[in-house]
């Protein structure tokens, strides 16, 4: 058992142009708070996956209101450490996710609004009981400076907090409330007692009686922020205007130690204490080898050309990052066309196509009517992944399979008699009326209400039956042509239909894998 501790030193705009002036939106003042999430070293860094090692939320920081035309400062932060207790062994390798959240205090309907301002994610190797490790991370235009450490809680000790011990003065038998003594390994010293009054938040000690300050704090008890400290004992050139020494840049400013190394000043220089797996003047050299399996998600580890160069990871499809730790949302690129549904199956991308489309990316338009012929001479009309049948006269229903009585709707006007016919219907008009539906009256003088028809088409003309016969032949020819067209389309699209069925089968198998 033990506690992971995180101290946020500063959060503010990063260097360079385009840095934000304020963390608050235009809606008014806001305040910051932090969330820390710890995951075991081999877990995915997806923020949604559980923080298996634990998580903690800071208190809200002071309210920040942007001063017009003022430079964006380091922002007011919540007080105190973020502490994440862990119950089991400390894993050594872990993912550290620090989120900076903004609480907007303007007139929000339903109370304050929260939004994620920045997230930094680091994979780290860290032994419990070691010194504070310092880090600077950038998240977009923001910069976060922080320190962290893992410490065991008695009776647990060791770099993984797995050994149990008792203080040297303790009796050998277990007292009430203590763990069984069986797994005890040698006697252990209690953690050092810091100098009396040493700040619990800004100071720490590795030897009894000392008080070492975290970055940004000074004074014998680490109570004084560097920016407002007195003139005594500070480095840098003398200020002629105040008679005080102005703080100058120290060798550890900006933390020259990479990869979570902690910096300590030496006369005229600095020294980095590197976490396990790194070495070099600035902890810039990775001591991790491919045999340690540093590439996540099955990534291929390739050693550098010489012993001092770092490994590289060749990631499987769907992963990226220097350690293949980040899942790529390949569906965000919208690879599926024609409204297909994208499925990222990890190692493969699949598109589930809408009706009427097929192919790996739904790129083939399957002619909606293929394989769905309309019966009885009906013609198929495509549209938006669906189809409908325009039925020949005498037939109805979705696929023109239902026989319809064309005379049921009494289509012949003015008392005309309706006769059903395979090509449609024929109206026998009452005297005085003419037209396909007997809709036109014939005037007594023999002139119709329409422009005069050619003599051969006058009402009652004996050639009328012949004209109907010609129309019937033409209709039959058209119907035959449509049938031939439908059959040829059917054949042409059969291969895409098969491809679509095969694709869906594969997708079903992979989703069940």
């Amino acid at each position: 058992a033990g506690v992971f501790e995180l101290q946020i030193h500063s959060f503010g705009p990063g260097p360079g142009p385009g840095a934000p002036r304020s963390p608050c939106s235009a809606r008014g003042p806001c305040r910051l708070f932090f969330r820390v999430c710890l995951k075991p070293g081999l877990s995915e860094e997806a923020a949604e996956s559980p923080c298996a090692l634990g998580a903690a939320l800071s208190a809200r920081g002071p309210v920040y209101t942007e001063q017009p035309e003022a430079p964006a400062p380091d922002l007011p932060l919540p007080n105190g450490l973020l502490q994440v207790p862990f119950r089991d062994a400390w894993p050594g390798t872990f993912s550290l996710i620090i989120e900076t959240w903004r609480e907007e205090l303007g007139d929000q309907i339903g109370g304050p609004a929260w939004s994620l301002l920045a997230r930094v994610t680091r994979r780290r190797r860290l032994a419990a009981g070691g010194p504070w490790a310092r880090d600077i991370q950038r998240a977009g235009a923001w910069e976060l400076r922080f320190s962290y450490r893992a410490r065991c809680e008695l009776p647990a000790v060791g770099t993984a907090c797995t050994r149990l011990c008792r203080p040297r003065s303790a009796p050998s038998r277990c007292g009430p409330g203590l763990r069984p003594c069986a797994p005890l390994e040698d006697e252990c010293e209690a953690p050092p007692v810091c100098r009396a009054g040493c700040s619990l938040e800004h100071g720490f000690c590795e030897q009894p009686g000392e008080c070492r300050c975290l970055e940004g704090w000074t004074g014998p008890l680490c109570m004084v922020p560097v920016s407002t400290s007195s003139c005594l004992g500070l480095r840098g050139p003398s200020s002629t205007t105040t008679g005080c020494l102005v703080p100058g840049p120290g060798p550890c400013d900006g933390n020259p130690c990479a990869n979570g190394g902690s910096c300590s000043e030496t006369p005229g220089s600095f020294e980095c204490t590197c976490p396990r797996g790194f070495y070099g003047l600035r902890c810039e050299v990775s001591g991790v080898t491919c045999a340690d399996g540093p590439c996540f998600n099955g990534g291929l580890c390739v050693g550098g050309a010489d012993p001092d160069s770092a490994y590289i990871c060749h990631c499987p499809p769907g992963f990226q990052g220097s350690n293949c730790e980040k899942r790529v949302d390949r569906c965000s690129l919208q690879p599926c066309r024609n409204g297909g549904l994208c499925l990222d199956l990890g190692h493969a991308l699949r598109c589930r196509c809408r009706a009427g489309f097929a192919g790996p990316r739904c790129e083939h338009d399957l002619d909606d009517c293929a394989g769905r012929a309309c019966a009885n001479g009906g013609t198929c009309v495509e549209g938006g992944g669906a189809h409908r049948c325009s039925c020949a006269l005498g037939f109805g229903g979705r696929n023109c399979r239902e026989r319809a009585d064309p005379c049921a709707a009494r289509p012949c006007a003015h008392g005309g008699r309706c006769y059903a016919h395979f090509s449609g219907l024929v109206c026998a008009c009452a005297p005085g009326y003419m037209g396909a539906r007997c809709e036109f009256p014939v005037h007594p003088d023999g002139v119709s209400a329409l422009p005069a028809a050619p003599p051969g088409l006058r009402p009652g003309d004996p050639q009328r039956a012949g004209v109907i016969a010609v129309i019937v032949v033409v209709v039959i020819a058209i119907v035959a042509g449509i049938v031939v067209l439908v059959i040829s389309r059917k054949k042409r699209m059969a291969k895409y239909e098969k491809a679509e069925i095969k694709e869906m089968g594969e997708m079903h198998r992979e989703l069940n894998a």
Partner: antibody
Framework: EVQLVESGGGLVKPGGSLRLSCAAS????????MNWVRQAPEKGLEWVGQ??????????HYAESVKGRFTISREDSKNTVYLQMNSLKTEDTAVYYC????????WGQGTTVTVSS | NIQMTQSPSSLSASVGDRVTITCKAS??????VSWYQQKPGKSPKLLIY???NRYTGVPSRFSGSGSGTDFTLTISSLQPEDFATYYC?????????FGGGTKVEIK
């Protein structure tokens, strides 16, 4: 030096069972995906199955040809991965290799499984 | 599953020859192709990953190229220790699949 050593191969009758082991050394075993790949006599390579890490809940994946018959498991504390083969068929006769990662970077020397009546 | 078709299935060559082996995927696999070398009675060894990257310790005479569906392994100057069987494998789509192999023999 990285070493993967397979064992447990032998002659078995159709319908029988066999358990192969692969012991790893020289690597942080718990950080590696492990696979079994087989090679039938005078034939090419065929991926059999895979087991991932504790953090992936030891997820397993299998080739269609062995699904439901073969089971992969691992014991990180012993640096060992296993292939339990049940309902063996003559077409399962092959040299079985264990190999690491998604890209099969480290390989063992193989163990021979013969299924014959 | 994606099919990998390797050609030729075997070839005879002399020391110093330039040898080219091709592999064709049944669908686009990007550059997720690896090449392996296997000597008789031994296990395969990774030579090339990501279609064109030499794996650690692989001599520079081995090179790979290609993307999409067509891939090539080239041995610029064949050495005595290169006589072996070579396999291509695709890693774009799960499950990984291999070509049938190309046996490089001494002429």
């Amino acid at each position: 030096e990285v070493q993967l050593v397979e064992s447990g191969g032998g002659l078995v009758k159709p319908g029988g069972s066999l358990r192969l082991s692969c012991a790893a050394s020289g690597i942080t075993f718990s950080n590696f995906w492990m696979n079994w790949v087989r090679q039938a006599p005078e034939k090419g390579l065929e991926w059999v199955g895979q087991i991932r890490l504790k953090s992936d809940d030891y997820a397993t994946h299998y080739a269609e040809s062995v699904k439901g018959r073969f089971t992969i498991s691992r014991e990180d504390s012993k640096n060992t991965v296993y292939l339990q083969m049940n309902s063996l068929k003559t077409e399962d006769t092959a040299v079985y290799y264990c190999t690491t990662g998604y890209y099969f970077d480290y390989w063992g020397q193989g163990t021979t499984v013969t299924v014959s009546s | 599953n994606i099919q990998m078709t390797q050609s030729p299935s075997s070839l005879s060559a002399s020391v110093g020859d330039r040898v080219t082996i091709t592999c064709k995927a049944s669908e686009n696999v990007g550059t997720y192709v690896s090449w392996y070398q296997q000597k008789p009675g031994k296990s395969p060894k990774l030579l090339i990953y990501g279609a064109s990257n030499r794996y650690t310790g692989v001599p520079s005479r081995f090179s790979g190229s290609g993307s999409g569906t067509d891939f090539t392994l080239t041995i610029s100057s064949l050495q005595p220790e290169d006589f072996a069987t070579y396999y291509c494998g695709q890693f774009y789509s799960f499950p990984s699949t291999f070509g049938g192999g190309t046996k490089v023999e001494i002429k």
